[in-house]
Interface confidence: low
């Protein structure tokens, strides 16, 4: 028997520095977790203690903090090289700055293979990107070889900016021939490493003949056997065992997100490459694990540029950006409108001639807007200003909801109106009218939404049975501020870009902004 230790991360989302327990900015070091310096300590400890170790990443290193905003992926290549990753799969967010934003900072600089079997380049891009990412890679480990095949969510064109010269194929269809090829090369230990979410990971384990282990990402799935060490609730045991169609037991793993845990899976293979046993658990990277001093010193060196960036002007406002709770928790506020407009703008994807865009709607809890911005400071808007408005380090995500769920959400928005509570919704691509004289749960008297399947966008009444795409904060997607109906009834959830980054990019693009209060939210006569 031959034993392999797989260490794995996924959805790190630019958390290079240690973070608080909820993966936001670290305030108190004795409570902070993760970060590449701490990760390196643990990885090195395991490399010293165990003979056959692979360190793998399942995608979405890009996007999530000011590190990515400033360094645009160069930081990912630099620190993943320093940690000596063995392989990485491409995630959807690796395309956030277009193909160029992937090729130059990461693909050309990485000293480890970057993989995806289901992304095919065409046209002029094919020769430019050739060899920079691979469908699979055979890695020598001790006296053996291990094959790694990569895969990426086929939804990436809707979630990021891969352009028109990359085709995202069905994962299972694309993986099978690559695995077959590895078998003909006498590689009998094969790991599928990819970024399509836990449901697809399980399908790959079930359907792709010859895959021994699946290491996934995208759905931020936390798996754990026994008592979980922090506040994440396990979606199942670690590893999650899937019985393949040809009768094999295939371990599937994921390690939550944000570098908070290091996935740790021990696999025992027989001489024919069959999995005899698999066990392990994610390791919580808490402050009992010291940060490696040399990586930490390097982080501090790279940090200097971030501090300078946060005070530079992104753009100007010529109007007061009203982010006060007195406005945003009671009525339409222009800060809410600005943020929602930025959220929609960030999700412009012309993927189908029938649609002007795949999504037109935004909702945003008023309680998530934490500060106004005064235009009388020469109109200057900085990252620092935006961090005061959106201090929680969240993301703006894409969900699919039925009209009936949206209606419930808007009823919840005003169910206890007048108490300055955070659930009052700011909107984009939506016109809502409330009648506060009616009883809670029956206060939405008009709800019109902007069409997507149209060449000239217009507002149509919400249809209860129709499925709509909506951009919203991850806080709401997870049921925050009492929006349990969103969490319980959503049909799909894809995590998006860092909230501040979305707004800062929009302001930089627009250069001068002047959002107005324009009648998106109205109260019917006599009640307000």
């Amino acid at each position: 028997a031959w034993e392999l230790t797989i260490l794995h991360t996924n959805d790190v989302h630019s958390r290079l520095e240690q973070t608080s327990e909820d993966s936001s900015k670290c305030v108190n070091a004795s409570r902070c977790m993760g970060g590449v310096a701490r990760l390196f300590t643990k990885v090195q400890q395991i490399r010293r203690a165990e003979p056959n170790v692979l360190l793998l990443d399942a995608g979405d290193q890009y996007q999530g903090t000011i590190w990515f905003t400033v360094y645009k992926g160069a930081e990912v290549a630099h620190f993943m090289n320093a940690l000596r990753y063995d392989a990485m799969a491409l995630g959807n967010h690796e395309f956030d700055n277009g193909v160029e934003g992937l090729i130059e900072p990461l693909l050309k600089e990485a000293k480890f293979p970057i993989l995806s079997a289901n992304i095919k380049a065409k046209g002029p891009l094919a020769s430019q990107i050739s060899g920079l990412y691979l469908p699979y890679k055979v890695l020598p480990v001790g006296d053996e070889v291990v094959g790694i095949v990569g895969y990426t969510s086929k939804e990436t064109p809707f979630l990021s900016n891969p352009g028109t010269n990359l085709v995202f194929e069905d994962e299972i269809t694309a993986l099978q021939p690559e695995v077959d090829k590895l078998k003909t090369l006498n590689v009998n230990k094969i790991i599928a490493l990819g970024h399509s979410g836990f449901e697809m990971d399980k399908l790959i384990a079930q359907k792709v003949r010859g895959v021994d282990v699946v290491v996934g990402g995208h759905s931020n799935t936390f798996l754990y056997t026994g008592n979980p060490p922090s506040k994440e609730v396990p979606a199942g045991k670690y590893p999650f065992i899937v019985t393949s169609d040809d009768g094999r037991k295939v371990p599937v793993v994921q390690a939550y997100a944000f570098g908070k845990y290091l996935g740790y899976l021990k696999i025992e293979f027989d001489e024919r490459g069959n999995v005899i046993s698999s066990h392990g658990n994610p390791i919580l990277l808490n402050s009992s694990i010291p940060e490696d001093p040399s990586i930490k010193a390097d982080i501090n060196k790279w940090r200097i540029k971030l501090d300078n960036y946060s005070t530079q002007e992104l753009g100007k406002t010529i109007v007061y950006l009203d982010g006060s709770s007195q406005s945003c928790r009671f009525r339409e506020c222009n800060m809410g409108n600005l943020i929602c407009d930025a959220m929609i703008n960030n999700n412009l994807r012309h993927t189908d001639e029938m649609f002007w865009n795949h999504v037109s709607m935004c909702i945003l809890n008023g309680g998530g807007i934490r500060s106004p911005i005064d235009e009388r400071n020469n109109g200057t808007i900085t990252w620092e200003n935006l961090a005061a408005v959106l201090p929680f380090g969240g993301t703006f995500d894409l969900v699919q909801l039925k009209g009936s769920t949206l209606k419930k959400a808007f009823e919840h928005s005003v169910h206890r109106y007048g108490q300055s509570t955070g659930e009052f919704l700011q909107v984009g691509g939506i016109h809502v009218v409330y009648d506060l004289s009616r009883k809670p749960g029956d206060r939405v008297v008009k709800l019109d939404v902007l069409c997507t399947k149209c060449r000239v966008p217009s507002y149509d009444p919400l249809k209860m049975d129709e499925v709509y795409k909506v951009i919203l904060p991850n806080f709401l997607a997870n049921g925050g501020d009492g929006f349990q109906m969103i969490k319980d009834e959503l049909l799909r959830h894809d995590s998006g870009d860092q909230d501040i980054n979305v707004v800062s990019t929009y302001i930089s693009k627009m250069k001068v902004i002047y959002p107005a209060v324009e009648g998106r939210i109205k109260f019917s006569t006599g009640s307000h």
Partner: antibody, heavy 118, light 107 residues
Amino acid sequence: QVQMKQSGPELVKPGASVKIPCKASGYTFTDCNMDWVKQSHGESLEWIGDINPNNGGTIYNQKFKGKVTLTIDKSSSTAYMELRSLTSEDTAVYYCARTNWDYAMDYWGQGTSVTVSS
Amino acid sequence: DIQMTQSPSSMYASLGERVTITCKASQDINSNLSWFQQKPGKSPKTLIYRANRLIDGVPSRFSGSGSGQDYSLTISSLEYEDMGIYYCLQYDVFPRTFGGGTKLELK
């Protein structure tokens, strides 16, 4: 006002176990972590560990791992520290201390004296 | 573990005198430092946290300062009830560690 109330002195035999309660009042129990500290006679203080009453998550000083188990009972707003396999080395006063938003200890229990003797 | 070296280990001072006790950490602790006062047979009482923030109800004659590895507690004008043992604690990394204590006695 914020108070941490601990039980009275314990005289226990070597090899036995003891479970010390620390009942919190005057604040929302789940808002603050609880730390435990050991003080042997005439000595300085030693940090034992910390428990988060929200999820029962614990962090222990390596030195006390296997010796100590920290638990909570949310319904009674009580934190507990169990000491196992007691020896004379465990003779000391044990304190619970609430930690504030900054994770700094702010309010202390009055201490429970544990004497291990046959 | 981080070592906390407190000095002096004991000292004598007169009423009304200005008293300073220092604490040195073996590495940078990012101002995550508390000071406690303990009287014989009593539990410790927290005076200061985050290096310089006074706990509610603690007299203003107590103050804390410092950053990085070096911290100090100052009593601007010593009063009789200030006699006791003073401890520092770092809570920047686990395990949290206390200084060895400074015994303050009346001259």
